[in-house]
Interface confidence: low
């Protein structure tokens, strides 16, 4: 018998609340199916029921999460019904506080090198899942370590390529819990770094500026970049922009940081729409100090 | 059924060690944590940690840390808790109990009859 | 200890210390004998538990109600959280007949 293909939409990672969709298609073309759970809590919505091409489950529940199976109509088969398919399993997020994920040396990573995620909660999770944005398959399963602060994971990841750059986020959960995730880390952007040739990175009216005085950034190059970065050596984050092609063929973008009260070490890079998380080589760095302020860094 | 069977009373000297045996039939040992519970009329009940038979996976209550000690045989399908060094203060009712495997929905589903420990000077 | 008639409506509370996210069980425990679970995730009911046990509660508060209190119902009930470790269990309360 021809087993049917469960497959979850918009993804297995579910937040306490929302709708899934499950959908069952055979490849003989039968569009009715029956849907089981194997493990937890039982979900009488399913039983003894008849679905025509989805379902569409929710709000749910952490009793939603576990192992789903469907079987389709199979009018040959002796029973009625196909193999069951393939197993999908639902988890639930937001049933424990978010823990929190940080990279170690940093979120921007060069071509070929290897990034540490670390994800930490004060909570005692023996179990944590690290998660890309728009992945579909499961995440990836991590078992933490315990301590008296609560519990950690670290996960090398590398060598660095676009395919690994995107934005994660982390989950916690207990063992006896396993299809129960904690609320989602807030979400950490790794990028990769170094794939494209170096921007150039220039500052109006100066590098040197009086307190208060506003300048201007501008980063450009002759590669057709859609996006610019600006990041100060130091800090999280960084400014983004869209790149405008100038009269003399260059791409460019002007970031205005207005009246500037400290200086400080920028670089820029440059991005293409279509792969948000891949990044050129950074601009040379760009040492702003200002005059007339104490403080410089 | 799942059924948890405890090993019997124990009278033991102080300072000394005792291990005592939770045998777990009707389920399949290696799916669920086995949870360990002291009761005491002084103290009431007090989670002392739990096994993860699977694995081997253990997570202590910090108070028993260095106290109890959990292992687990998935031959025999027998969860056993050693406590060392033993004071008047561990003479107390020790449950196993098994959690659901999923969820822990039932706090703990199952328990074992107790084991009395009593410490003598 | 807590003294109600047969047929009285009855109500355990428990508070925990923080939010504990609805991660709470009910247990009766009679003398001699191991505790046997009641209520789970705060308002579950055990299989083959009698109805006429609930529970209800969420944050930090929480409560066990027999509808119609029956001798066989006397016994020390706790409630036990595990949102997170290590587990707590409450101090217990003896119900009695009055």
């Known amino acids: 018998q021809d087993k049917p293909f469960l497959s979850a939409w918009p993804g297995t990672v579910v937040s306490e609340g929302q709708h899934v969709t499950l959908q069952c298609r055979s490849r003989l073309g039968f569009n009715e199916f029956s849907l089981s759970k194997e493990d937890g809590m039982p979900v009488p919505e399913l039983y003894n029921r008849i679905f025509r091409n989805s379902f569409l489950m929710g709000p749910v529940t952490p009793a939603h999460a576990g192992t789903y199976r469907c079987c389709s109509s199979h009018p040959h088969s002796p029973t009625g019904w196909s193999a069951p398919s393939n197993p999908v399993v639902i988890m639930v997020t937001g049933v424990h506080r978010k823990p929190s994920l940080l990279a170690h040396p940093g979120p921007l990573v060069k071509s070929g090198e290897t990034v540490i995620l670390q994800c930490w909660s004060d909570v005692r999770f023996e179990r944590f899942l690290l998660h890309r944005e728009g992945i579909t398959e499961d995440p990836l399963r991590l078992v933490g370590q315990l301590h008296d602060a609560g519990s950690q994971v670290n996960y090398s990841m590398g060598p660095m390529t676009p395919a690994l750059a995107g934005t994660y986020r982390c989950f916690g959960s207990v063992t006896h819990l396993p299809y129960e995730l904690s609320a989602p880390s807030d979400p950490l952007d790794i990028v990769v770094v170094g794939l494209y040739g170096k921007p150039s990175l220039s500052a109006q009216p100066g590098p040197t500026v009086q307190a208060g005085e506003n300048v201007t950034l501008s980063c450009s190059s002759r590669s057709l970049f859609d996006i610019y970065h600006l990041s100060r050596e130091a800090e999280a984050g960084e400014l983004r922009l869209t790149a405008v092609l100038r009269v003399n063929g260059t791409f460019q973008a002007n970031f205005p940081l207005g009246p500037v009260t400290h200086g400080g070490n920028y670089r820029c890079f440059g991005s293409f729409r279509a792969l948000p998380h891949a990044w050129s080589d950074p601009s040379d760095p760009l040492p702003v100090s200002v005059t007339g302020n104490s403080r410089h860094l | 059924q799942a059924y948890l069977q405890q090993s019997g009373a124990e009278l033991v000297r102080s300072g000394a060690s005792v291990k005592m045996s939770c045998k777990a039939s009707?389920?399949?040992?290696?799916?669920?944590?086995m949870h360990w519970v002291k009761q005491t009329p002084g103290q009431g009940l007090e989670w002392i940690g739990y096994i993860f038979p699977g694995d081997g996976g253990t997570n202590y209550n910090q108070k028993f840390k260095g106290k109890a000690t959990l292992t687990a045989d998935t031959s025999s399908s027998t969860a056993y808790m050693q406590i060392s060094s033993l004071t008047s203060e561990d003479s107390a009712v020790y449950f196993c109990a098994r959690s659901g495997y999923y969820g822990n929905y039932e706090g703990f589903a199952y328990w074992g009859q107790g084991t009395l420990v009593t410490v003598s000077a | 200890s807590m003294y109600a008639s047969l047929g009285e409506r009855v109500t355990i509370t428990c508070k925990a210390s923080q939010d504990i996210n609805s991660y709470l069980s009910w247990f009766q425990q009679k003398p001699g004998k191991s505790p046997k679970t009641l209520i789970y995730r705060a308002n579950r009911l055990v299989d083959g538990v009698p109805s006429r046990f609930s529970g209800s509660g969420s944050g930090q508060d929480y409560s066990l109600t027999i509808s119609s209190l029956e001798y066989e119902d006397m016994g020390i009930y706790y409630c036990?959280?595990?949102?997170?470790?290590?587990?707590?269990f409450g101090g217990g309360t003896k119900l009695e007949i009055k």
């Open positions: 009707g389920y399949t040992f290696t799916s669920y944590n």
């Open positions: 036990l959280h595990y949102a997170e470790f290590p587990y707590t």
